[in-house]
């Protein structure tokens, strides 16, 4: 008799996707020296152990600290780039610059970069047809649990200058229900982060307008004021002309021609 | 607009040191590069380095290994820290600050630096 299986409103867990996260874990402590000591099976062994045989809205931080704990990772504190719905050009800038880091340039972001996972109630069973929706069935989903629980992590380890990518086509540039408008902003340290720089994004070639004067932009400037963080904005008119003059600072293009 | 008010030029010996500071206020959210560019008599202005907001920077192979720029945030404040100067390197220092792709390009007014025995 095959049993009945939950049908949740959002995509199931992504393909292959024991296979992926072993690969992605193998491939970057390859690529980055720092974490070559970290054994991928238990990493995924610990994953699994996250969200297999649990009822997929039920899951908690603490269900991930295995895997927090062996993902441990010292980035630069002062080096952390943060971003709100761009998250593309987030990941061209640091290519490009590379000793300044998104949360999906730490092996734990790496991992569950752009994949969907859930498990079944007293199964062992990955579930593949489909996963809990944040909106529709439940937050405390796998999927959603993770990135808050990394995204915490992320902005408590920031100190210095934060910087944060927003995107300036949005109608809200900045989102209070946003992963950075939620979770973020509201664990930076004051006592280690000095200022929050926001890197607001035109969308449109002939866009001149002063973005950094929006509404949610005040929003966050008032939030971040409140929480004794400085807060600068800058407009980044010519996203294309901006990382090709990251990457070649010397670049006559970097500046009116004479 | 943005106003960009430059100081520390003067006279050093060769060999010498001196640091340069830029300081821009106005629309100042319409700046992501700040630099400097140098123009001796009669010769053309030419650039000498500069900072990208989030940290990149750039310098003019004369310079590599003398100078080193760099800006503070909270002051909207860029410095050209110059060591081992020497006699080619007398020239009026102007701070550039800008937008990449847009017409947001200021110039200061200059500071004269002088390297001389």
């Known amino acids: 008799v095959p049993r009945w299986r939950q049908q949740w409103s959002g995509p199931g867990t992504t393909k292959r996707f024991p296979e992926t996260v072993l690969a992605r874990c193998v491939k970057y402590t390859e690529i980055h020296p720092e974490m070559r000591h970290v054994d991928c099976q238990s990493v995924w062994d610990a994953f699994k152990g996250a969200f297999i045989s649990k009822h997929p809205c039920n899951i908690t931080e603490e269900d991930y600290q295995p895997l927090m704990k062996l993902g441990t990772q010292t980035v630069p504190c002062n080096k952390i780039l943060l971003w709100s719905r761009i998250k593309d050009l987030a990941h061209q800038f640091t290519q490009v610059q590379r000793d300044m880091f998104t949360l999906e340039d730490t092996l734990l972001g790496y991992l569950a970069d752009d994949l969907t996972w859930c498990g079944e109630f007293n199964t062992s069973k990955i579930n593949y047809q489909s996963c809990p929706d944040w909106r529709k069935d439940c937050s405390n989903n796998p999927v959603s649990v993770f990135w808050k629980t990394v995204s915490r992590r992320f902005a408590e380890a920031a100190c210095d200058v934060v910087h944060v990518m927003l995107n300036g086509s949005r109608s809200k540039i900045f989102d209070k229900n946003s992963t950075f408008g939620s979770v973020e902003v509201h664990n930076l340290q004051p006592e280690k982060v000095q200022t929050l720089e926001a890197w607001v994004i035109h969308g449109g070639r002939e866009d001149s307008r002063d973005l950094c004067q929006d509404p949610t932009i005040k929003e966050l400037e008032s939030i971040i004021s409140k929480r004794n963080i400085q807060f600068s904005c800058k407009n980044i008119y010519r996203p294309d002309k901006f990382l090709q003059c990251v990457k070649n600072p010397e670049d006559s293009s970097c500046t009116s021609e004479i | 607009q943005v106003k960009l008010q430059e100081s520390g030029g003067g006279l050093v010996q060769p060999g010498g040191s001196l640091r340069l500071s830029c300081v821009a206020s106005g629309s100042i959210s319409s700046i992501i590069t700040m630099g400097w560019y140098r123009q001796a008599p009669g010769k053309q202005r030419e650039f000498v380095a500069r900072?990208?907001?989030?940290?990149?920077?750039g310098y003019a192979d004369s310079v590599k290994g003398r100078f080193t720029i760099s800006r503070d945030n909270t002051k909207n404040t860029v410095y050209l820290e110059m060591n081992s100067l020497k006699p080619e390197d007398t020239a009026v220092y102007y701070c550039n600050a800008g937008n990449p792709g847009t017409s947001y390009h200021y110039w200061g007014q200059g500071t004269q630096v002088t390297v001389s025995s």
């Open positions: 900072v990208i907001i989030g940290g990149s920077t």
